[in-house]
Amino acid sequence: EYSNCGENEYYNQTTGLCQECPPCGPGEEPYLSCGYGTKDEDYGCVPCPAEKFSKGGYQICRRHKDCEGFFRATVLTPGDMENDAECGPCLPGYYMLENRPRNIYGMVCYSCLLAPPNTKECVGATSGASANFPGTSGSSTLSPFQHAHKELSGQGHLATA
C-alpha cells in the first residue's frame, strides 16, 4: 500500500508496488509533487529559471552565487542551468582573511579599509586608512566580520538560496 512508499516513491496502481518518482536531469527541478505514495497527474521536471542551477535528481534549482555583490569577489566562471558560478580573487579594495575557517557564506572578501598593515591584496590600497573603496564607507569603524556582515546584508538571498 502507498503508506509504505518512500520520500521519492509513488504507488503504482497497476503493479501494486512503490515506484521511483522520475528523477530530473541536470538543469531541471521537480515540479508539482511526487513521493510518499502519491504523484500528481501533471508531475514532471521543468527547466531551472534564469540565475538558478540544479545538478538533477530531486534537487530544486538554487540561485547562483553572487560573487561580486555578495562575496565581493570576481567571477571566475559564470553559472548556467547545470552549474553554480565560481568565484575568483577578491575585487579591488578587498582581501581574503588567511587561516580563517569558512563561514556559512564560504570564503568572503573583506574591505581593505580594515585590513592589517601590509596585507598583500591591499598594498597600495592604503590598508587601514579611511580611503573609499567600492561598497564601503570611509568612516567605517566596524570589525572585519561586522563589516563583511553589513555588506552582505540587504542581499535578497544567501549564496545557496
Epitope: Y31, E41, D42, Y43, G44, C45, V46, P47, P49, A50
Partner: antibody, heavy 120, light 108 residues
Framework: EVKLEESGGGLVQPGGSLSLSCATS????????MTWIRQPPGKALEWLAL??????????EDSPSVKGRFIISRDDSQRILYLQMNALRDEDSATYYC???????????WGQGTLVTVSA | DIVMTQSPAIMSASPGEKVTMTCRAS???????LHWYQQKSGVSPKLWIY???NLASGVPVRFSGSGSGTSYSLTVSSVEAEDAATYYC?????????FGGGTKLEIK
Amino acid sequence: EVKLEESGGGLVQPGGSLSLSCATSGFPFSDYYMTWIRQPPGKALEWLALIRNKANGYTTEDSPSVKGRFIISRDDSQRILYLQMNALRDEDSATYYCATVGGYYRFPSWGQGTLVTVSA
Amino acid sequence: DIVMTQSPAIMSASPGEKVTMTCRASSSVSSSYLHWYQQKSGVSPKLWIYSTSNLASGVPVRFSGSGSGTSYSLTVSSVEAEDAATYYCQQYSDYPLTFGGGTKLEIK
C-alpha cells in the same frame, strides 16, 4: 474537474490595448505554472508567455513576437491568469487560449479560447 | 528559435489503415520535452501524447509516439472516423517554446 475560462476578447483598433482574463477552478492554481497560447484563424498554434508559481517568484518567459507588448500576470487569491496586450497589431488577431503547464512543459488543460480581432 | 516542421500537411486515410505523421526539429530536442496535441475543428486543442510516447488520459491505445533528437512521429495503428483532426507537435529545448504547423488527418 479542471476548468479554464478566458474572457476579455473583442474588436480593437491597431495600436490599442486589451486585457484578457482566465478564471480557473478544479486544481491547485497557486502550485501551477500557467501559459497563454494563440491561434490565428486557420493557422497553427503559437506560444506567447509563461508565468511560474510563487515558489519561483512569479517569474515569466515571453515569446519574442510579443516581448515588450504583452504582459502575463496572475492573482493566486482569485485564481485568475491575465494577459495585458498593448500596441496591438493586425497580426495579433487570433483565438487566445490559457492553459495549465505540466511537467516537461506540456500543456494538459486548455480553456475554450477568446477571440481577439485587431482591425481598423 | 527551434522550428518544428510537420509532414505531411494534410493526409487522408480509410478506416482501419495505419498512418504515421512526422515532426522534425531544426535542432535536437529532448524526448521528455516533445508533445503532441489533437485539435478538432472549432474546439480547443487537447494534450494527446506527452514526452514522446506517453498517452494522455483517455487517449485510445491505437495511438503511439516515438522518436529522438530531431525526428519524432505519431502513429495511429488503425484509423477510426473520430480521429479526424489536426495534430500539432510542441517542443521545449530553449525559449521560445514552439509548435509545428500541424498535420490534418482526414478520413475517407
